[in-house]
Interface confidence: low
């Protein structure tokens, strides 16, 4: 048994006569043989659930659900109730109505086994019938809404008549009807004005009925019509088995370059026309089990369940449903030597589904784990300026497909064939598993015998120690020019284009800093700044070379304070800045300020 509403509303007036009928509460059956029996809670409650007093005024007919006044509520009783309401004015009281058999303990009042009946209290006697407006003669102040469980026996869930009005104003004729589309499952009995379902409802066909209740009032020669919404929501039960959309129960996947823990290898989607169990319970009640295969597969993969509500069209209206994505995920990094093919099965169980049939599906994942071979091109040829400063990035080496790698740890090393010409260094980029070549020794660059540098690049997979090799030929070009006196170590210090471009700084491939002119659009990623190379700095990312020395690119790497209009980078540097940003790495400070106007004519006039 369950209530068709969680709350009912009616008006109460001072000195309303004992025996006045107030309203009906309605219960619907979960099974055909059930017979409802109603029971009132012992107490009246006020604002903020304050227990006011034992209920001595209102009674219920246990079999019909009719609430009526057992005795009149007079001024003094109301005053006493008001005093107990924690000092708040007492405008509304409520009672709890329970469906027997339920526990006789009057605890929380939760639908479906309990409903609240709210009474708006008027500190006057019942108004004269002639003064009541049609709206007051027809409907309660609060619009009702109804909840009906799907697949349950049909029954009466509402009674239109306002009982106190009918009781006290017998000469006013009030008629009701429901405006509804063809074939809807509701009827309003013309004599009793009871609204009932004609048959069991199916939520998967229709979830909401937006009906309209029409009330016609006849008082003497006067006839008026009042219309109010009459919404019915169909509540779901787990009556739909999970299915495969388009019959797809198998996903095939190849694990090759993406071998990192938490990589999603494949996804299978399961559709369930139901929206129960609710989200809080869903993962506990909608289980997925990776069926025991070999131990390796059990350790290597896990299944993640990602449920999402969706809408599907049914009979011209949209109803909610659930899609469950089951993701096969790598549980650990896979070695590049791993090479196997397997079928994994996942048992999905909608444990609340009662049938007919089974609420169980078997998902199949066909997974091929391919080995990865390390290959480098036979030769790399690069050039470097003799003026390049330390940490200048001059190129990249990359094993085949390295941009696609994840979970593969490749380290690059350089072996120099000329002992005194170890000009370059290499560091591995965590982002794309490439090796970034940079100038490590500027003195060696200037030696005439180091005009051509020969290296062997060795790429090693850290887990398996597998290697690949390539020749690296570096040509040193141009002539060395000594640094201007008084230039800072970091390009980022310079605030103006002129001073920027006449100096070099750490990380500069040409021996000169480069000016990046911003777009001047407020706080922008494209702020003006001085950089060793605008290809790499600033780009919103502190790369593995830039981490070697804070002076290279503090715009990307500084962890200190940034003064002025800016948006901080995650986790460091300047993501966006206002005007021009310059930095003082030693002081761990950057400043973003409006662009300077450097017009000489203006300078003259301003004097």
């Amino acid at each position: 048994l369950y209530f068709s509403r969680d709350a009912y509303w009616e008006k109460l007036y001072v000195d309303q006569a004992a025996g006045t009928p107030l309203l009906y509460v309605h219960a619907l059956r979960d099974a055909p043989e059930e017979v409802p029996s109603f029971r009132l809670g012992q107490h009246l409650y006020g604002t903020y659930r304050t227990r006011l007093h034992e209920n001595n005024w209102i009674c219920i007919q246990e079999d019909t659900g009719l609430l009526y006044l057992n005795r009149s509520l007079d001024h003094s009783s109301w005053e006493k109730l008001s005093v107990r309401n924690r000092g708040f004015p007492l405008l509304t009281v409520y009672l709890k109505v329970f469906l027997s058999p339920t526990s006789l303990r009057e605890g929380e009042c939760q639908w479906p086994g309990c409903a609240r009946v709210y009474f708006s209290f008027f500190n006057t006697s019942f108004p004269a019938c002639s003064s009541l407006k049609p709206r007051e003669l027809c409907f309660p102040e609060t619009r009702p809404s109804f909840r009906i469980r799907e697949n349950r026996p049909p029954g009466t869930f509402h009674q239109f008549r306002l009982l106190p009005v009918q009781f006290l104003c017998p000469n006013i004729s009030v008629a009701y009807r429901l405006l509804e589309g063809e074939g809807l499952p509701f009827r309003c009995a013309p004599d009793s004005l009871e609204v009932s379902t004609r048959w069991a409802l199916d939520r998967e066909q229709r979830e909401k009925y937006e009906l309209v209740a029409v009330c016609t009032v006849h008082a003497g020669a006067r006839e008026e019509v009042v219309m109010v919404p009459f919404p019915v929501t169909v509540y779901d039960e787990d009556d739909s088995a999970p299915t495969f959309p388009a019959g797809v129960d198998t996903a095939s996947a190849v694990v090759e370059f993406k071998r990192k823990e938490d990589t999603v290898v494949a996804t299978l989607r399961v559709f369930d026309a139901d929206v129960v169990p609710a989200s809080g319970e869903l993962v506990r009640r909608y289980t997925s089990t990776l069926l025991p295969g070999d131990t390796w597969a059990q350790q290597t993969f896990r299944v993640e369940h990602w449920p999402n509500e969706t809408s599907v069209q049914a009979n011209g209206s949209f109803v909610r449903a659930t899609v469950h994505d089951y993701r096969l995920v790598l549980n650990r990094n896979l070695s590049i030597s791993e090479n196997r093919t397997m079928q994994l099965a996942v048992l999905v169980n909608d444990s609340d589904f009662q049938g007919p049939g089974a609420g169980v599906l078997l998902l199949h994942f066909n997974v091929s784990v391919l080995p990865v071979s390390l290959h480098l091109p036979s030769t790399y040829s690069l050039s470097v300026s003799r003026r390049a400063r330390r940490f200048a990035q001059i190129g990249k080496v990359c094993v085949e497909n390295c941009q696609a790698f994840s979970g593969i740890n490749v380290q690059y090393k350089l072996h120099s064939s000329g002992a005194n010409c170890s000009t370059l260094g290499v560091v591995t980029s965590a982002e794309d598993t490439s090796g970034i070549l940079f100038v490590n020794d500027t003195k060696a660059l200037r030696r005439p015998k180091c005009a051509e540098l020969h290296y062997m690049v060795v790429a090693t997979d850290q887990q398996t120690s597998r290697q690949a090799q390539a020749q690296l030929l570096v040509t040193v070009e141009g002539s060395y020019v000594a640094e201007e006196a008084g230039c800072p170590l970091s390009c980022a210090v310079s605030k103006r284009r002129l001073e920027c471009e006449e100096c070099g700084g750490l990380g500069s491939p040409t021996g000169r800093c480069e000016w990046r002119q911003g777009d001047g659009k407020g706080i922008t990623r494209n702020f003006s700044t001085c950089s060793p190379s605008t290809k790499t700095c600033p780009d919103g990312h502190c790369d593995v070379v830039e981490t070697q020395d804070i002076n290279i690119c503090p715009q990307d790497c500084l962890r200190g304070s940034i003064v002025g209009g800016h948006e901080p980078g995650e986790p460091r540097g300047i993501k966006a800045g206002y005007g021009t940003c310059n930095c003082f790495p030693e002081e761990e400070k950057c400043f973003c300020e409006p662009e300077d106007i450097q017009d000489p004519l203006c300078d003259e006039l301003c004097r």
């Epitope: 019959g247 797809v248 198998t250 069926l291 025991p292 295969g293 070999d294 131990t295 078997l362 199949h364």
Partner: antibody
């Protein structure tokens, strides 16, 4: 009660074709993978082919791959095995079996005899 | 494909005897192995699945053990109705395969 009833077995010439059917009842057919197993006279059991619950995935023994096709019609609760290019070594009793969720075969039909001979 | 080899191929024993049949897999099949009995003229029936779980309705004198590549089926006290061929089957990966069978005969 779970029941599996095979039909379609016959005497057929080498190179010929035959279609076996297996009518299922007593369980929700569309929820279970199904399989065909055969047994040559006086020999052991040989797994022939399997199909997933929806029919989206099919699996075959190497000895029949490219010649046999497994399929199912969930609306008719029926499993099929289309056998083409039949050879003398395909002579056997063919059983259809229901797979449990964990893969093993918990219910079997009574079998249907296929004889390939000239 | 995974090959299963049963030993012995033939076994003579008497009522009341304890007998053991072994099944070797050519590669790791975890515990994904089942044992079937086939009475003459009938379809096989499953005795043990998941290497050691007794199928409901099967007498407790049957038991299974093992994992990985070596598995055994033990009948603790032979009954007259137990004389039949027995097959192991791996369900670890497709194609599923059966052992060649062990024929248990009355001595």
């Amino acid at each position: 009660e779970v029941q599996l009833v095979e039909s379609g077995g016959a005497l057929v010439q080498p190179g010929g074709s035959l279609r076996l059917s297996c009518a299922a009842s007593g369980f929700t057919f569309s929820n279970y993978a199904m399989t065909w197993v055969r047994q040559a006279p006086g020999m052991g059991l040989e797994w022939v082919s399997g199909i997933s619950s929806s029919g989206a995935s099919t699996f075959y023994a190497d000895s029949v791959k490219g010649r046999f096709t497994i399929s199912r019609d969930n609306s008719k609760n029926t499993l099929y095995l289309q056998m083409n290019s039949l050879r003398a070594e395909d002579t056997a009793v063919y059983y259809c079996a229901k797979e449990d969720y964990w893969g093993w075969f918990d219910y079997w039909g009574q079998g249907t005899l296929v004889t390939v001979s000239s | 494909d995974i090959q299963l080899t049963q030993s012995p191929s033939f076994l003579s024993a008497s009522v009341g005897d304890r007998v053991t049949i072994t099944c070797w897999a050519s590669q790791d099949v975890s515990s994904y192995l089942a044992w079937y009995q086939q009475e003459p003229g009938k379809a096989p029936k499953v005795l043990i699945y998941d290497a050691s779980t007794l199928q409901s309705g099967v007498p407790s004198r049957f038991s299974g053990s093992g994992s990985g590549t070596e598995f055994t089926l033990t009948i603790s006290s032979l009954q007259p109705e137990d004389f039949a061929p027995y097959y192991c089957q791996q369900l670890n990966s497709y194609p599923y395969t059966f052992g060649q069978g062990t024929k248990l005969e009355i001595k």
